[in-house]
Every structure is written in structure tokens, then in C-alpha cells.
Amino acid sequence: TLNSVLNSNAIKNLPPPLGGAAGHPGSAVSAAPGILYPGGNKYQTIDNYQPYPCAEDEECGTDEYCASPTRGGDAGVQICLACRKRRKRCMRHAMCCPGNYCKNGICVSSDQNHFRGEIEETITESFGNDHSTLDGYSRRTTLSSKMYHTKGQEGSVCLRSSDCASGLCCARHFWSKICKPVLKEGQVCTKHRRKGSHGLEIFQRCYCGEGLSCRIQKDHHQASNSSRLHTCQRH
């Protein structure tokens, strides 16, 4: 059951070594702090991953989606689950790993010329004029006047990065573009193999900050080159 997954609420991560308080998240990947598991004092790497409760896909990382871990899914706690690779079953785009999308219940590669049109069709069909739902989710970020809070702050609607405050860039978030934080050292970044392929992303990441470049993480050994994790690293 889900309770056993969460082990009676004992999602006990070690205190953050890199901030986390005062509105700053800790370093995303590079520090990979140990995680303290309930009932034991073992430090374990981030690969033995602790369940992360979520309400929506956007709360999860780029390689995850939000769902109930039990088949059939009770209406209780949902957690971030690993994204589905190509040819795996899916119910919505967010379930598929980056570079893939959900078509006819299967994750397929987005490296296809017709993909962009298809995504835009899906968005148009789902939202019509009232921007109500996508993939069964309740109201998403909209372009209404409500979104224009302090100009250029995180989450503000933008057209280009110059619209955003320092330390933020303008990146795609569903069908709109919003100001998101420029990536810091160790954070996951997107390395585009094909020119223009960033147009396919529903959740676009910012670029790496000054003095950093997006490179394959050295210790990230995976079978296929294409699925290797890229992080922002010092030049």
C-alpha cells in the first residue's frame, strides 16, 4: 500500500547542506546528499530514492511525473514516479521521459516533424478559449491579467528573457512562456542535439548560468548516449 511506500510518513531527508531555507532550494543534483531511511542510520545516495509526495506533475523533476504508486491509484497521497521510457504505456504526456510524448497510450519519440503540430493541436483541443484543462489537470498557468504580478519575477508571463528579472530566463511552460530561474552548478540542463529541438519541450529549462556549460555528468553511466544526464558544470 501507499502507507508502506511512505513508511508511516517517514520521508526523512537529511537537513539540507546547501540552503533550502529562506526561499532557496538546495543544490539539485551535484551534491547528491545522503538520504536517511526510516529505522536505520545508513546514508544512501540519491539513486536509492525516497518517495516525494506531489499534487501535480510540475512539482516533480524533469524525469518524473506525479501519480499514485498503487495500481488503480487510490485517491490518497501521490508521489513522483520515474518517467516512462519509449514504447512504455502512458496516459498523458507528462508520464513520458523528456524527448518523448504520449500517443495512443504509448510513449513515442518526439524527434518527429509532426510532433510539434500534434502537441499544439492537443493544447488547442484541451483548452479551447478558456484554457481549462490539459491531460485531466485543473486550470494551468493562464495568460490572464492575474499572471502579470511583479513584472519579470519568477512565474511571470514573458516573451523574451529580457522581460525577466536578473537570474531568470523566459522559458516555455505548457503553451505559455514564464520567467524561470537560470540554472546553477549541478542542476540538470537540456543539451539539444538538433537545432530547434527546444521548440518541442512543454517544460523548457533555462540555460546554465554564467561560467557554466551544459555537459554530460561524468559519473552518469547509462547504456544509451542519448539518455545521459546533462548538468551545468564549470567551464
Epitope: P33, R139, R205
Partner: nanobody, 124 residues
């Protein structure tokens, strides 16, 4: 800059109640699910409760279910946690938090944006 400021903590006897508040600023509050997490002395972060953007759905850890109630006021950019029937094991620093989301490859409580926290002590 994302800012979350918690208040409402204090010393309370077992069985007592407290209401925590969290004032959010620096981001469009209404488009983010929010949560409360806590950290007991010498322990790691522990998830307590979650609420969707519109407040329509809530989730609770087993240890607080039926005793705690999470709510939000999007017009005021405020998040709340009503804590009833408090127990000594609820003693902790309580943080209001928001996910870092798609900036990381895998989400973790450590990567969340959160405030400085408010101390809740349950003791007779």
C-alpha cells in the same frame, strides 16, 4: 525572489491546538501546489501535508491525518495549517514549502523552496 514566512508556532500542552500561517511572495502563489513539512530535533525533513493550487484537494501524512487541516487563501497569498489534538511527537520546526519542480531531474524535499520555519513545541 521566492519568499515564504511562517508564523503561529509556540508552546502548547498535549491535546491543544495551534494555527500556523505562511505568507508567500515573489512568485504567483495561486499557480503552485503548496505543502507543509517539518523537522524534529536531530531528525530529517518529514512531509506533513499538501494542497492543490485551487485548494480543492488535500493530502496528509498518516501521522497527522484527522488532526491537521491544510488550507489556503489565494487572494491573500497565504497558506495555513490548523493543528488539533497535538501530541509530543508533533514537536518540530514547521516549514511552508513549494516544489522546485522542473528545474531538477528528480524532486526531493531538500530541493524545495521553504521559509525559515516556526517552532512548535508540545509539552506538559
Amino acid at each position: 525572489e521566492v519568499q515564504l514566512v511562517e508564523s503561529g508556532g509556540g508552546l502548547v500542552e498535549p491535546g491543544g491546538s495551534l494555527r500556523l500561517s505562511c505568507a508567500a511572495s515573489g512568485f504567483p502563489f495561486s499557480i503552485y501546489p503548496m505543502k507543509w513539512v517539518r523537522q524534529a530535533p536531530g531528525k530529517g525533513l518529514e512531509w506533513v501535508s499538501h494542497i492543490t493550487r485551487d485548494g480543492g484537494r488535500t493530502m496528509y501524512a498518516d501521522s497527522v491525518k484527522g488532526r491537521f487541516t491544510i488550507s489556503r487563501d489565494n487572494a491573500k497569498n497565504m497558506l495555513y495549517l490548523q493543528m488539533n489534538s497535538l501530541k509530543p511527537e508533533d514537536t518540530a520546526v514547521y516549514f511552508c514549502a513549494r516544489s522546485a519542480g522542473k528545474v531538477v531531474s528528480r524532486a526531493s524535499l531538500e530541493n524545495d523552496y521553504r521559509g525559515q520555519g516556526t517552532q512548535v513545541t508540545v509539552s506538559s
